[in-house]
Interface confidence: low
């Protein structure tokens, strides 16, 4: 909780959690109770802090720019708005989350720039033949989807260095000389046709292309992708259009440090290096780009990659596409016969998805997304909507929180993959207290100016301490705060101010005593309850409430439950301990020691029952039952019984006989008489 966080300043208090507030009201607490100023706003109000003195900054969203989403066709593509809002400031209280809603709508008839990047290694000869009319066919199909379509063309083979190419003069001039066939010298990347709406020009360019060759199977296509993405002006990418890069190949691609084989060790710099002939001039100088570098530049330039690759390569490029935002893979027939349908399908797939990406200074920031897609369906922890129709709106709840109070603001961009539109977000921490602006330096409230007064408390100058800086260094001896010289100051549970202990607050109860040596929570427990819940804990000992006694206060002093029916405590056969009889007499039992078959003279008390039993014959024995009941006994004829704990009796009968029997006790404490017999009876007179 806020109050237990030990905050001594307003800023420390706000850092404990978003639920905490600080009371800057003067004289709000006892001088030592600085920590009491930090609590929930409700608790501070309840404690008497006036509302205008409660420092409790809240997270807030300030929208700077929120143009409505474009609906229908726009005359000017620069007027198109596909994300709303476009700019906002988020003031966040550390630990407190703020949710904002972002809406994305792919506008109808959005301009499309498509750059056709083709592998021109020898195996692509048949493909080159197939696509000679692709420009006009593609323009015709795309005109059904957009009224503003442009096409461009570039080609690639491989870095023209050993061991990727053969280096004899003959094979450098004609890498196909061993076939024999004429093909162009190996090249890295050539940008041939900037983006244009002239489809016939595209056809013409394609017809003029010649294949080239290299040795190993992987090609240098990633070098070409990097140049096509970053050479924005030369390629002709427009600001307000969908940028599609169609990568056509039948082989894998080299990346990263593969070029070390050729002694090329300078990392790719991600910059445009097209010379005056629009050829990649650093092909033999810079390493292939890494996948990470490609991702950065494709995202930065809003380029959506369509891998059109043959069957053997599909799996490989699917793995690359998983890593590259917005990338798709299409299966290319051996001769590129299905390239048109592949491009149209990929375009439709891209247009049916809206996915957000986050760029900028996000480290340590907690961002979570919920996508709200078709028909308002919520997808938690997702930032992508699929199966959308162009013109549909996708919404996203974005929840942001910062864990702690950093001193900087962060700039973040949330944008749909492949679109230029973005939401710019400035996240700034909200942790300052307004009361900190009003500082009374050398304040008289701080004992003759020994400190500065702000936010209701004193910040003491060096050499002074105490709630009002009233304690100088000469008064800082802690000896009077120690119970014994080797004991910690204030028992380690308080602060020594000017020779006196001010005990800490504790979540468990009160700490008190001149040395904070006492508390009301460190006593013994009975059944998990402090002092059995029948007493108060005072400095480690239970002080029992009225009616209770014992170390644990679990012993009642009442004797009511010990009094037997005859009004005698424990029937006079035991002691009343903790409200229960502890029977002292052997054989005594029962809640009040009322059962005791062996008490008094057990044998003689059964005489009337025994004699009746012996003198009666047959049916007359029934008459004895009442006599036996009065004597608290029953007679058993059973011979098989336990003799443990039995009492053996001998009585002189009326006829001078010796009567012997045994008494046992049943579970209810009643007497049972066994083995009755008469002995030594006098013989009757011998009368003839």
């Amino acid at each position: 909780g806020c109050a237990l966080g030990g905050a001594e300043t307003c800023e420390d208090c706000l850092l404990i959690g978003p639920q905490c507030a600080w009371c800057a009201q003067e004289n709000f607490t006892r001088p030592s109770g600085v920590g009491e100023r930090c609590d929930t706003p409700a608790n501070l109000l309840a404690k008497g802090c006036q509302l205008n003195f409660i420092e409790n900054p809240v997270s807030q969203v300030e929208i700077l720019k929120n143009k409505p989403l474009s609906v229908g066709r726009q005359k000017n593509s620069s007027d198109i708005v596909q994300i709303a809002p476009q700019s906002l400031i988020l003031k966040l209280r550390p630990g407190g989350a703020q949710t904002l809603q972002v809406h994305v709508r792919q506008t109808e008839d959005y301009p499309v720039d498509l750059y056709y990047l083709m592998d021109l290694s020898a195996s692509m000869d048949d493909d080159l033949n197939t696509i000679k009319e692709l420009g006009s066919r593609l323009s015709k199909e795309m005109s059904k989807l957009t009224s503003n379509f442009r096409l461009g063309f570039g080609s690639f083979v491989e870095k023209p260095v050993s061991p990727f190419v053969k280096t004899t003069p003959e094979e450098i001039a004609n890498p196909c000389s061993s076939i024999p066939y004429f093909c162009l010298p190996t090249f890295g990347f050539k940008h041939i046709l900037p983006l244009t709406n002239d489809a016939e020009r595209f056809n013409e360019i394609v017809k003029n292309q010649k294949i080239s060759a290299n040795i190993d199977t992987p090609e240098g296509g990633f070098d070409a992708i990097m140049q096509a993405a970053v050479c924005k002006e030369k390629i002709g990418w427009r600001n307000d259009s969908l940028h599609l890069l169609v990568f056509v190949s039948d082989a894998d691609s080299h990346f990263g440090m593969d070029s070390k084989l050729a002694g090329i060790v300078i990392p790719n710099d991600g910059l445009c290096h097209l010379d005056s002939k629009n050829e990649y001039s650093m092909s033999t100088v810079l390493e292939y780009p890494t996948i990470g570098q490609l991702i950065d530049k494709l995202v930065q330039n809003n380029v959506l990659l369509i891998f059109a690759v043959t069957q053997e390569q599909v799996h490989l490029y699917e793995n690359y596409a998983k890593l590259i935002p917005g990338a798709t893979v299409g299966l290319l027939q051996k001769d590129s016969g299905n390239i048109l349908q592949l491009i149209i399908s990929a375009y439709e797939e891209l247009r049916s998805e809206v996915e957000l990406e986050v760029l900028g200074d996000t480290e340590g920031l907690n961002l979570s997304f919920t996508a709200i897609c078709n028909n308002g369906t919520f997808f938690q922890h997702q930032k992508k909507c699929s199966h959308m129709k162009v013109g549909d709106t996708a919404s996203f709840n974005v929840t942001v929180n910062i864990p702690n109070c950093e001193r900087r603001s962060r700039h973040i961009i949330i944008k749909p993959v492949g679109l230029g539109d973005a939401l710019e977000l400035l996240v700034s921490p909200e942790c300052n207290c307004d009361c900190q602006k009003e500082v009374e330096v050398n304040s008289s409230k701080c004992h003759h100016g020994n400190g500065s007064f702000q936010c209701g408390v004193c910040a003491c100058h060096p050499g002074h301490m105490g709630p009002r800086c009233e304690c100088g260094e000469d008064m800082l001896s802690t000896d009077s705060c120690k119970e014994a010289p080797d004991h910690p100051s204030c028992s380690g549970r308080g602060d020594c101010y000017c020779g006196q202990c001010i005990c800490h607050l504790s979540p468990y109860g009160n700490i008190y005593g001149p040395y904070c040596q006492c508390d009301n929570f460190s006593c013994v427990r009975h059944k998990g309850l402090l002092c059995g819940d029948n007493g108060d804990c005072d400095c480690g000992e239970c002080v029992c409430r009225s009616g209770w006694t014992g170390e644990y206060c679990n012993c009642t002093t009442s004797t009511d439950s010990c009094v037997s029916e005859d009004g005698v405590l424990c029937s006079g056969r035991g002691d009343c301990v903790c409200g229960k009889c502890v029977c002292a007499n052997p054989g005594a039992s029962g809640p009040t020691c009322e059962r005791c078959p062996t008490c008094g003279d057990p044998c003689n008390s059964k005489r009337s029952c025994i004699e009746c039993h012996l003198s009666a014959a047959g049916q007359a024995r029934e008459e004895c039952v009442d006599k036996c009941k009065l004597a608290g006994a029953t007679i058993s004829e059973e011979e098989d019984f336990s003799k443990d704990g039995s009492v053996s009796c001998s009585l002189q009968g009326e006829n001078e006989c010796l009567i012997t029997f045994l008494i046992t006790t049943d579970n209810e404490g009643k007497s049972i008489i066994h083995s009755i017999s008469e002995k030594d009876c006098p013989k009757p007179p011998n009368i003839p």
Epitope: G6, N404, P488, L505, S506, S522
Partner: antibody
Framework: QVQLQESGPGLVKPSQTLSLTCTVS??????????WTWIRQHPGNGLEWIGY???????SYNPSLKSRVTISVDTSKKQFSLNLTSVTAADTAVYYC????????????????WGQGTTVTVSS | EIVLTQSPGTLSLSPGERATLSCRAG???????LAWYQQKPGQAPRPLIY???SRATGIPDRFSGSGSGTDFTLTISRLEPEDFAVYYC?????????FGQGTKVEIK
Amino acid sequence: QVQLQESGPGLVKPSQTLSLTCTVSGGSISSGVYYWTWIRQHPGNGLEWIGYIYYSGSTSYNPSLKSRVTISVDTSKKQFSLNLTSVTAADTAVYYCAREGPLRGDYYYGLDVWGQGTTVTVSS
Amino acid sequence: EIVLTQSPGTLSLSPGERATLSCRAGQTISSRYLAWYQQKPGQAPRPLIYGASSRATGIPDRFSGSGSGTDFTLTISRLEPEDFAVYYCQQYGSSPRTFGQGTKVEIK
């Protein structure tokens, strides 16, 4: 003078449960002033906090071990115990029990009393 | 969790020299909840400093602690032979409690 003594098997088989007990002598385990703590140290490495228990039974565990660790207290025996399930060779370490002053307020003390430690090896 | 980073990893000094050990927290912590411990081979750690600057019982005054916020320092003004050991800082202001990785002070 409070003293702590760890006890338990020195060898535990992989996938089994490691069980250690710490006995408190010379002072009360039922004081409201202390957290009773377990810490371990892998061979040649630094110290890793496992968790603590308050005499009332409330606990706090290291998130990295939370799913496998249980700390319990028996105030009548003045003991607190550590159970670590599904152990692997990575749990081989010296295990210490220690006493810590409470978290809130200016209970400055930190881990002021330590046991001498017990070595536990996890091996089949 | 709060990450504590100690530097240097090893400090090679001669007896009589001054040792300065640093402990940096990944986020602001209250100095009330920072401690320093000394550990010698085969022994349990021994408390030296609590509350960033208060010496534990029986600790000689050549050991002193200072710092606040994210930067804390343990200073040994004149190294004695028995001071060569590993020193750890620890925060106990929030769970999980965390230790620094340790600084070894060895004889040069």
